[in-house]
Amino acid sequence: MMTGTIETTGNISAEKGGSIILQCHLSSTTAQVTQVNWEQQDQLLAICNADLGWHISPSFKDRVAPGPGLGLTLQSLTVNDTGEYFCIYHTYPDGTYTGRIFLEVLESSVAEHGARFQIP
């Protein structure tokens, strides 16, 4: 029986050219996390496997950094980074948990007014 829940940063906005941390947290379960996939719509951004560690897609290597923890840091943001991001937690013995984050990348002047959505 799956008892866990995924908490995410939810809907966030960030400034063009800036950085943002995509963070998911699995709680209310003692299941072992065997792998986390970070996906953006139809693309695999990164995988963190308990046995193999991190692997980042070459397409994003210059702009994506692993961590903190099982999160993902996106750098040098562009408007094209706007969209849905998914953290997919594969666990033993529970199975799979999925979290969703919507990121909106704004032009600098607009982002200043939406600063309340920024991650410190």
Epitope: L44, N49, H90
Partner: nanobody
Framework: EVQLVESGGGLVQAGGSLRLSCAAS??????MGWFRQAPGKEREFLAI???????LYADSVKGRFTISADNAKNTVYLQMNSLKPEDTAVYYC???????????WGQGTQVTVSS
């Protein structure tokens, strides 16, 4: 018992192609990957494919190697083109199976690229 069986290795001339296969018996996987280890070197990650057919490659092989899956046969392939002598190594597949604690590794298949 879950097993991975690799095949398709062999001797090929530089510039040639090979297709490796990795057949998984028994269980469904949510990620399968290919790795290689040359003599005296560390194991190197090459490519991984998820159960949703999303792929991720190492810089060293992107554009030359292609990972794909036949879910009906529970088999993952590595198509290797434009092979170079430095691609000579033992190639291993690994699978993260659903509801399993750790990766399962295949026994490896030798690939030798002659100049």
């Amino acid at each position: 018992e879950v097993q991975l069986v690799e095949s398709g290795g062999g001797l090929v001339q530089a510039g040639g192609s090979l297709r490796l296969s990795c057949a998984a018996s028994g269980r469904t996987y949510y990620a399968m990957g290919w790795f290689r280890q040359a003599p005296g070197k560390e194991r190197e990650f090459l490519a991984i494919i998820t159960d949703g057919s999303k792929t991720l490659y190492a810089d060293s092989v992107k554009g030359r190697f292609t990972i794909s899956a036949d879910n009906a046969k529970n088999t993952v392939y590595l198509q290797m083109n434009s092979l170079k002598p430095e691609d000579t190594a033992v190639y291993y597949c690994a699978a993260q199976f659903t509801l399993a604690r750790h990766l399962v590794w295949g026994q490896g298949t030798q690939v030798t690229v002659s100049s």
